[in-house]
């Protein structure tokens, strides 16, 4: 072509795949007449006419441009759709009239690339390989034109490094024209790369600018042989009985050696291995004294067979012995005095209460509790409580039941029941003394007795209302070596007038009396005398 | 037959390096666990350094740690022993050693070994 | 670390006499599961390099004669030359395994 040498840059036109791209003659009227216009592609130096415009009407040529050709803008720009990268040439419009003109424009396709996928090295890296080995290998799918990887450790690029970093790149021409890049990441890694998070980064172009994609962060298994070995124990802190404690070995290599926990047995001088759970960790549930100890983790790399002791770790469970109180069934007269003492062995420094049971009223801090001038209300229960107060929950206690001698002591004297007649009544009476009583009664009936505690008795009678026990009433009589005593339980018929509440009365039918102690069975009205009541 | 044969061993300064090699023959070398021992004059043996078959794990006394390299080349049927920061104490014979194939960690074959002044 | 300790540092026997050697280590090296101990006898003629003769405390490597043999468990150990023989003139090492590796300081047997 005559000036060929002369000829500007050509204008370049950049438009992403897919789209359609605009190629507008820029012949000035001086040029050519835009309405004789012939359009030509250039494909290693080959040109091919593809266009003609004649009196301002378009006609595609036969051939690969054929389908995808159309004038726009009064014939001036020639509109290329659905561009692939294979349209990455330079295209030329030629004036006929006056002079033989042309006008060139060179065509730029970009396809951003597919979200860079990133598969790291599923076999690890050993520490001590002798040459870079594979960490990563990074995939960028139809791009256009190949895109720039960038590879990251840590959040910083990484270079080329004899020995140490090789970024090895290759890509694929896809069907469509589109690359496919591959990268390779190998290293020599540290043990301190364990952590290190590795990405790669597509750079690439647009018709807009500069673009870049990142991929997910990854590790990669480091493999390091074990230098230390230790022992955990959870909880922290101070353990004691029945507490569920867990003995972990651990070791700074990777994968973990295999592990054995061993306990130190005094006696023999001998380490005992424990019988550990699948994840090597032994578990004390609950724990006991006898669990104290020296512990020791032995871990062996089996590729070596070389073998590693941890330091040992004293393990101290702390507990309370069972508790002792002496005397330990005490017996006293009334009037007399009496010294409980409470003893128990700890592994840490015990501390001593005693309560009284009924009430939990704490009477003495110590192990010694003295009481005199002892009354009949003194007997019953005492309990002694050792703890140790550095460790919460770690107490144990134990109770004592003094007795009192004296003669059978009732828990009413008098007592009125509402009843109807001919219903089986159950009715209960208790006593309390020292020897422990035996009640009888003055009626015919079923009775049967039972021991609510070694000094206490409880008896009910079930007995059928009839005219001649509402007249005389039920008595009870309760009898030891040391005498007798009775409680009366009066008889009285439910009738309207009785149902009206007031202060002193109960409410309800009853088939049973209870003691001030137990609640009625809900079947009968059941009205206490006037207190004070003789305990006599 | 089993056969180790030492050598790099020489005169160095306090604060040098030495590269020690140990040629194998008469069994799969790829296949054993190797390691070095040393004997100062006058001394108790001391194991210096542990490589496993594939090269991957290796163990050192803290004494040498840091210090001194245990390598292997599998393709070569050769040991190495990098000593850098070389010390008086240093100073020894340098006994390339197999272990064999029981659960314990023995050097069942020992070569003939190499000695190491380390001396200004 | 383990210290392993030998006795006595030297010993002179008559031929055809029993020897027996001590070592001592710091801590126990039986593996209670398997029920074996982390311990290896080794012999060294003067000029040559070590040689393994036992392993396991007791168990003897082929080869060796059976004048040797090797006992104990947890830190006490003994190794016995039943017949003493002419070319048995060697130091002797124990070396433990249980905790990287450590050997004893030797003993010299002689003729005497």
């Known amino acids: 072509v005559p000036g060929e040498a002369e000829q500007p840059a050509p204008e370049l036109v950049e438009v992403e795949v897919g789209s359609t791209a605009l190629l507008k003659c820029g012949l000035s009227q001086s040029q050519g007449n835009l309405s004789h216009v012939d359009w030509f592609s250039v494909h290693k130096e080959k040109r091919t006419l593809i266009f003609r415009v004649r009196q301002g009407q378009g006609q595609s040529e036969p051939g690969e441009y054929e389908q995808r050709l159309s004038l726009q803008d009064r014939g001036a720009t020639l509109a290329l759709t659905q561009v692939t990268p294979q349209d990455e040439r330079i295209f030329l419009c030629q004036g006929k009239r006056p002079r033989s003109q042309e006008y060139r424009i060179q065509l730029r396709v970009y396809k951003a690339p597919e979200e860079p996928n990133i598969q790291v090295n599923p076999l690890g890296i050993p520490v001590n390989s002798k040459e870079p080995e594979e960490v990563a290998t990074c995939v960028g799918r139809n791009g256009y034109p190949i895109p720039q990887v960038i590879w990251y450790k840590n959040g910083r690029p990484l270079k080329e490094e004899k020995n140490r970093v090789h970024i090895q790149s290759s890509q694929t021409v896809e069907s469509s024209g589109l690359y496919t890049l591959q990268s390779i990441l190998k290293a020599q890694l540290v043990k301190e790369d364990k952590d290190a998070q590795f990405y790669c980064e597509l750079n690439y172009r647009l018709p807009s600018g500069n673009h870049m994609k990142e991929s997910r962060e990854v590790t990669v298994p480091v493999f390091y042989p074990t230098e230390k070995v230790w022992l955990e124990v959870e909880p922290v802190g101070m353990l004691k009985e029945g507490d569920r404690v867990e003995i972990r070995c651990l070791a700074d290599g990777n994968p973990p050696p295999h592990f054995s926990i061993s306990k130190g047995n005094p006696s023999t001088r001998e380490a005992e291995e424990e019988t550990t759970n699948d994840n090597g960790v032994l578990v004390l549930e609950p724990a006991r004294k006898e669990h104290s100890g020296r512990y020791e983790c032995q871990a062996w790399n089996l590729d070596t067979m070389i073998s590693l002791l941890s330091e040992p770790q004293e393990l101290l469970v702390n507990y309370v012995s069972d508790v002792r109180v002496s005397p330990a069934a005490p017996e006293r007269q009334e009037g007399s005095s009496l010294t409980l003492t409470c003893e128990a062995e700890s592994s840490q420094d015990l501390e001593f209460q005693w309560l009284r049971e009924e009430t939990d009223q704490v009477l003495e801090r110590g192990p010694v509790l003295q009481l005199h001038d002892l009354k009949r209300e003194a007997g019953g229960g005492y309990r002694c409580v050792a703890s140790v107060p550095s460790i919460p929950g770690l107490n144990r206690t134990q109770l004592v039941k003094l007795a009192i001698f004296g003669p059978p002591w009732m828990a009413f004297k008098e007592r009125k029941v509402w009843v109807k007649e001919n219903m089986v009544l159950n009715l209960s009476c208790e006593a309390s003394g020292h020897p422990r009583p035996t009640i009888s009664w003055n009626v015919n009936g079923t009775a049967s007795e039972g021991d609510q505690d070694p000094q206490r008795v409880l008896s009910t009678l079930n007995v059928l209302v009839t005219p001649e026990l509402l007249e005389t009433g039920v008595e009870c009589t309760a009898s030891n070596d040391l005498g007798k005593n009775t409680s009366i339980l009066f008889l009285e018929l439910v009738n309207l007038t009785t149902l009206t509440p007031d202060s002193n009365t109960t409410t309800g039918l009853s088939t049973s009396t209870a003691s001030p102690h137990t609640r009625a069975n809900s079947t009968s009205t059941e009205r206490k005398l006037p207190e004070p009541e003789s305990r006599g | 037959e089993v056969q180790l044969v030492e050598s790099g061993g020489g005169l160095v300064q306090p604060g040098g390096s030495l590269r020690l090699s140990c040629a194998a023959s008469?069994?799969?070398?790829?296949?054993?666990?190797m390691s070095w021992v040393r004997q100062a004059p006058g001394k108790r043996l001391e194991w210096v350094a542990t490589?496993?078959?594939?090269?991957?794990?290796?163990y050192y006394p803290d004494s040498v740690k840091g210090r001194f390299t245990i390598s292997r080349d599998n393709a070569k049927n050769s040991l190495y022993l990098q000593m850098n920061s070389l010390r008086a104490e240093d100073t020894a014979v340098y006994y390339c050693?197999?272990?064999?194939?029981?659960?314990?960690?023995?050097?069942?074959?020992w070569g003939q070994g190499t000695m190491v002044t380390v001396s200004s | 670390d383990i210290v392993m300790t030998q006795s006595p540092d030297s010993l002179a026997v008559s031929l055809g006499e029993r020897a027996t050697i001590n070592c001592k280590s710091s801590?126990?090296?039986?593996?209670?599961?398997?029920?074996?101990?982390?311990l290896a006898w080794y012999q060294q003629k003067p000029g040559q390099p070590p040689k393994l003769l036992i392993y396991?405390?007791?168990t003897r490597e082929s080869g060796v004669p059976d004048r040797f043999s090797g006992s104990g468990s947890g830190t006490d150990f003994t190794l016995t030359i039943s017949s003493l023989q002419a070319e048995d003139v060697a130091v002797y090492y124990c070396?433990?395994?249980?905790?990287?590796?450590?050997f004893g300081q030797g003993t010299k047997v002689e003729i005497k």
């Open positions: 396991w405390a007791s």
């Open positions: 070396k433990q395994s249980y905790n990287l590796l450590t």
């Open positions: 490589i496993s078959s594939g090269g991957s794990s290796t």
């Open positions: 008469g069994f799969t070398f790829s296949s054993y666990i």
């Open positions: 801590r126990s090296l039986l593996n209670s599961r398997i029920r074996k101990n982390y």
């Open positions: 050693t197999r272990d064999d194939d029981y659960d314990v960690k023995v050097f069942a074959y």
